[in-house]
Interface confidence: low
């Protein structure tokens, strides 16, 4: 397995609707046709898989139907969106990229994006 550099933003603030987007960019050493992108969440020294998708170069990412992630790809960049986030989901979200085909296999892991999620304050009752 060969190493590959992956870059992602250090910090992202989720929207009030619990949506966070960030770009994951990888330095592709060759012309991969199949790329695997995995989002990992690290919190309290625990690492869990948030979502994963495979795409063919020049095509859209396909996540499982019940995934909280969506994404698009453009060249060596993947635009990832994670939805349904709550304050408790605040943590370090790591982008892992694998060049699956053709050989050789390359693996790259980013330093992580700290996503901050602030639950919106409930709207006060209004009298009209």
């Amino acid at each position: 397995c060969k190493a590959m550099h992956v870059a992602q933003p250090a910090v992202v603030l989720a929207s009030s609707r619990g949506i966070a987007s960030f770009v994951c960019e990888y330095a592709s050493p060759g012309k991969a046709t199949e790329v695997r992108v995995t989002v990992l969440r690290q919190a309290d020294s625990q690492v869990t898989e948030v979502c994963a998708a495979t795409y063919m170069m020049g095509n859209e990412l396909t996540f499982l139907d019940d995934s909280i992630c969506t994404g698009t790809s453009s060249g060596n960049q993947v635009n990832l969106t994670i939805q349904g986030l709550r304050a408790m989901d605040t943590g370090l979200y790591i982008c892992k990229v694998e060049l699956m085909y053709p050989p050789p296999y390359y693996l790259g892991i980013g330093n992580g994006t700290q996503i901050y999620v602030i639950d919106p304050e409930p709207c006060p009752d209004s009298d009209f």
Epitope: A52, T54, M56
Partner: antibody
């Protein structure tokens, strides 16, 4: 709603040919793997072949390599399995399934292929 | 190629029992292991993906876990509709392989 409907099964003699079809609807056909998986009577599941319609990428199990050909028509949202030089051991229910990278998340109802003289 | 050895091949259990099915990979694999349920005459249905993620619409009594090369499907409290055959499956490069299956029967 995601749907996969297989057709084309039937009785064929050893050495004969058959073409199975898998009509897909309810999702972007070209951006998912489409698999064929078979199940011999009373036996377990055996993965047969896969295609990624967007690029035409294909791969086969060793047991069918050189005899079976998987293809897809994105204009018809349909995948095919052309089976040549059929043997008695190819007798099975053939399922088509939609796949993400590691899993097969939607399956058709299956079509029975019987190879017998 | 990686082989998935599933055990037991069959088991008898009662409604309410806790049931555990194991798949052992012949060599180190990723967590790209899924579990399916199949009833007679029907197509398989996805239960668990990525070793431990519960698929949409699947009851929470089903769970998956991993320990090294061992992958486990657990049904915490067996229900009448759970009597079926269960298969594990993994992808190794461009081969998708299934375990031999475990038939869960009524005791």
């Amino acid at each position: 709603e995601v749907q996969l409907v297989e057709s084309g099964g039937g009785l064929v003699q050893p050495g004969g040919s058959l073409r199975l079809s898998c009509a897909a609807s309810g999702f972007t056909f070209s951006t998912y793997y489409i698999h064929w998986v078979r199940q011999a009577p009373g036996k377990g599941l055996e993965w047969v072949a896969v295609i990624y319609p967007y690029t035409g990428f294909t791969y086969y199990a060793d047991s069918v390599k050189g005899r079976f050909t998987i293809s897809a028509d994105t204009s018809k949202n349909t995948a095919y399995l052309q089976m040549n030089s059929l043997r008695a051991e190819d007798t099975a229910v053939y399922y088509c399934a939609r796949g993400e990278y590691t899993v097969l998340d939607y399956w058709g109802q299956g079509t029975l292929v019987t190879v017998s003289s | 190629d990686i082989q998935m050895t599933q055990s037991p091949s069959s088991l008898s259990a009662s409604v309410g029992d806790r049931v555990t099915i194991t798949c052992r990979a012949s060599q180190s694999v990723s967590s790209a292991v899924a579990w399916y349920q199949q009833k007679p005459g029907k197509a398989p249905k996805l239960l668990i993906y990525s070793a431990s993620s519960l698929y949409s619409g699947v009851p929470s009594r089903f769970s998956g876990s991993r320990s090294g090369t061992d992958f486990t499907l657990t049904i915490s409290s067996l229900q009448p509709e759970d009597f079926a055959t269960y298969y594990c499956q993994q992808r190794d490069s461009y081969l998708w392989t299934f375990g031999q299956g475990t038939k869960v029967e009524i005791k």
